[in-house]
Structures are given as C-alpha cells and as structure tokens.
C-alpha cells in the first residue's frame, strides 16, 4: 500500500528519486569497469514523515513506534521500491564483457 | 550479495533484528484488532557502515557516494530483507475474522 504522496515538509523534502552524477573513480569501479566513464546514479533520498509513501504494514508500525520511542525506533527510511537495469562494460581475465545489473539504479522510492 | 557481517562499530551496533514490545494502543490498532493484545514487533535497527550487509550493488554505490558526499547522499539504511507472516484477529462489520499479514514482522535485515 503506497500511502500519501503529499510531503508535509515542503516540496522536494520527502522521500523521492534523486540523480547523482558519479565517475568510475567515485564509485570505486575504475579497476574493473571500462564504460561508462560516468554514471547518472538514481537513488532514493529524503525524509519519511508519518505515512508518507509507506511501503507496507511494517512501515506503518515503524512510524507509530518511532512516534512513541524516537530514541529506540528509527523513522522509516527512504529506499528503492524497484530498480532500472543497467549495463556495464567490464574487464574480465581475458578481455571485456557486457554485463547487465538489475539492482544498480533506483526506479522509484518508498518508505520502510 | 550480502557483504560482511562483522560490525566495525562494536557488538550489536550495526544493522540487525531487534524486538520491540508494543500494545494495540501503541500501534494505533485498538479500534480494529482484537488479538493479540500485545505484539513482539521484530524490526531492523542499527547502523550500516561501509559494506556491512550490503543488500545489492545499489547499496554499495550508496556507501561509496556517502563517503564522498555525506551531506548529499545518506548512508545505506537498515531495512527488512524478508518478513515473517503474522495473523491478527480483527473486527469486521459482522463480527471477527482471522487475517494473515505477510509484511508485518521483519525476519532478517540488510542495508540498502
């Protein structure tokens, strides 16, 4: 159940997809990836206020218990709900291969 | 790929399963759940230092970019990797029903 998409903290402050430009060096991939030299990394960033994009019942529980025990129970966290696949040209023992990764780039986000 | 399970921050400080005792009132369920009166809620709590229980490639990317841009990119977050089902006796218009929920209790945890 995806709950409310209205962010009470103001536009862009709540859990959503962001794009961060990163080089192979930034990612620590320079020794095993040849291409791309730069990646537009999509990731989930932002606050998860009460019931905002709650992924499931567990997220709703977490919200309730965080309100009661903020020092013990953390608020729900903004994480990928699904991913977009991506290919990398990577070095192998004998040369290069084109490899698909299904869990690299966030496609959309929710709170859990 | 589940990466290292050794916590560099000390025993019990990193992402792991915790149990939090909660009443129906705590959970905001008192008006629609009859039983149980109290739930042993299992949830994922703790820090996600570099490569600790990294859920996938995305988590590894997040770790690298958090190290580079800590103000922009948050560290990976401790969330459920899977769930244990739970039944609730809940009120209905005509009486009660026994309902199974698959996404209520965390079974194990990873960082993402």
């Amino acid at each position: 159940a995806r709950n409310g998409d209205h962010c009470p903290l103001g536009p862009g402050r709540c859990c959503r997809l962001h794009t961060v430009r990163a080089s192979l060096e930034d990612l620590g991939w320079a020794d095993w990836v040849l291409s791309p030299r730069e990646v537009q990394v999509t990731m989930c960033i932002g606050a998860c206020p009460s019931q905002f994009r709650a992924a499931n019942m567990h997220a709703q529980i977490k919200t309730s218990l965080h309100r009661l025990k903020p020092d013990t129970v953390p608020a729900p966290c903004c994480v990928p709900a699904s991913y977009n696949p991506m290919v990398l040209i990577q070095k192998t023992d004998t040369g290069v291969s084109l490899q698909t990764y299904d869990d690299l780039l966030a496609k959309d986000c929710h709170c859990i | 790929a589940r990466n290292g399970d050794h916590c560099p921050l000390g025993p019990g400080r990193c992402c792991r399963l915790h149990t939090v005792r909660a009443s129906l009132e705590d959970l905001g369920w008192a008006d629609w759940v009859l039983s149980p009166r109290e739930v042993q809620v299992t949830m994922c709590i703790g820090a996600c230092p570099s490569q600790f229980r990294a859920a996938n490639m995305h988590a590894q990317i997040k770790t690298s970019l958090h190290r580079l841009k800590p103000d922009t990119v948050p560290a990976p977050c401790c969330v459920p990797a899977s769930y244990n089902p739970m039944v609730l006796i809940q009120k209905t218009d005509t009486g009660v029903s026994l309902q199974t929920y698959d996404d209520l209790l965390a079974k194990d945890c990873h960082c993402i």
């Epitope: 040849l34 291409s35 791309p36 977009n84 696949p85 040209i89 290069v96 084109l98 780039l105 | -």
Partner: antibody, heavy 118, light 107 residues
Framework: QVTLQESGPGLVKPSETLSLTCSFS??????????VGWIRQPPGKGLEWLAH???????YFNTALKSRLTISKDTSKNQVSLKLSSVTAADTATYYC??????????WGQGTSVTVSS | DIVMTQSPATLSTSPGERVTISCKAS??????VAWYQQKPGQSPRFLIY???YRYTGVPDRFSGSGSGTDFTFTISSVQSEDFAVYYC?????????FGGGTKVEIK
C-alpha cells in the same frame, strides 16, 4: 539469447523513403547504456554507420546523411525504426541493425538487402 | 569526421602464419578503436574493444594494440576459419567511422 532481425521492402524507387524495422529480443531498450544502431554495406564495399538511438532516446546520425535520416524506438514492442528519405541508387546496400552497449556493437542482425531502382 | 585508413587492402597468407593489419586514424582517438570480422554472406562479428580488449568468447590468437592514431590488429597463427574481411572502427566520437577493410585470403 540476443537476436536482431531487420525487415524492409527489398525494392524502393528513387526519391522515395526507405523504411526499415529492427525487431529484437534478449535485451531491453529501457536498460541504461543500451542502444540500437544501423549500419549499411553497399554490394562489395565496406561498412558505413548510419545512426543509433539510446535507452534515453538520445539520437546520433551520420553527418552526410543526417538531413535524410529519422530513427525512432518502440520500447514496449522491442523495435527500432529507421527512415531514409529521397533515396538514390547510391543507397542500394545491405542494412544491418546492431545491439549496442555504450560504444560496443556486439550483436548484429543478418541484414536486409535493399535495392533502389525504378 | 574521423577518417580510418586500413592497410593492406588484401593480405595473402597461409594457415599457421602471423597476420598484422594496420589502421590509422585521421586524428587522436585515444584507444577507442574496435575490430570486426566479416565472412562472405554473414554479418560482422565483434572482436576487439578499446584497442586491446578481446570480447567475450573471442579466441586469444586475436589481439589488438595501439593508441592515438596508430593501431594494429594481429592474428598470431591464422586458422582456416579466420580467412575473412577485417574492419577497424573508431568509437571515440560520433559519427562512428569504419576503415575500408582488409581481406585476409589463402595464399
């Protein structure tokens, strides 16, 4: 496994528009880094790159042919189309489509032969 | 556009011999040169990426080297199935361009 199949009219009259379709399987054009390119080869001659289209809909064209070329994709149908307008006998060739991963063209179709003649 | 010039146009050799093909770019393309093999009636087969990296499944008798403007493709010991046309291609910048091809034929 990855396969690509070109289809076209076989015979086109001068000044008309040549329409080609590349139908593929084994990969998705919604995957970051993936593209489909078109290359042609006149009879007994070498290879000439024509155009390519990327997962994000960015398009690139052969400089000399740019004004005559159109490329488009239908991600849900796993198809890429190429149109070449105002054809002449010089456009007679075997037309290939190829799967691209960044700057690698690793899988090619078998090609479709196109003759421009009245 | 970057012009790729291959030499020789034709090369006659015998099985077991070493074969070397040259490719020159009209401007610096770093190491961004690929090599393809094409047999009669077939589509091109991708062999070498970025001057020297063999693609998955390509036998190690095929190799490439070079950077800047001068590139070399080598077959260390030609097999009967290697008689074909070989093309270099720059992937440094679009428009991508191919060399004119080198036909490796049986002497």
């Amino acid at each position: 496994q990855v396969t690509l199949q070109e289809s076209g009219p076989g015979l086109v009259k001068p000044s008309e528009t040549l329409s080609l379709t590349c139908s593929f399987s084994g990969f998705s054009l919604s995957t970051y880094g993936i593209g489909v390119g078109w290359i042609r080869q006149p009879p007994g001659k070498g290879l000439e790159w024509l155009a390519h289209i990327w997962w994000n809909n960015n398009k690139y064209f052969n400089t000399a042919l740019k004004s005559r070329l159109t490329i488009s994709k239908d991600t849900s149908k796993n198809q890429v189309s190429l149109k070449l307008s105002s054809v002449t006998a010089a456009d007679t060739a075997t037309y290939y489509c190829a799967r691209m991963g960044y700057d690698i063209m690793d899988y090619w179709g078998q090609g479709t032969s196109v003759t421009v003649s009245s | 556009d970057i012009v790729m010039t291959q030499s020789p146009a034709t090369l006659s050799t015998s099985p077991g011999e070493r074969v070397t093909i040259s490719c020159k770019a009209s401007q610096d393309v770093n190491t961004a040169v690929a090599w393809y093999q094409q047999k009669p009636g077939q589509s091109p087969r991708f062999l070498i990426y970025s001057s020297s990296y063999r693609y998955t499944g390509v036998p190690d008798r095929f190799s490439g080297s070079g950077s800047g403007t001068d590139f070399t493709f080598t077959i260390s010991s030609v097999q009967s199935e290697d008689f074909a046309v070989y093309y270099c291609q720059q992937h440094y910048s679009t428009p991508w361009t191919f060399g004119g091809g080198t036909k490796v034929e049986i002497k």
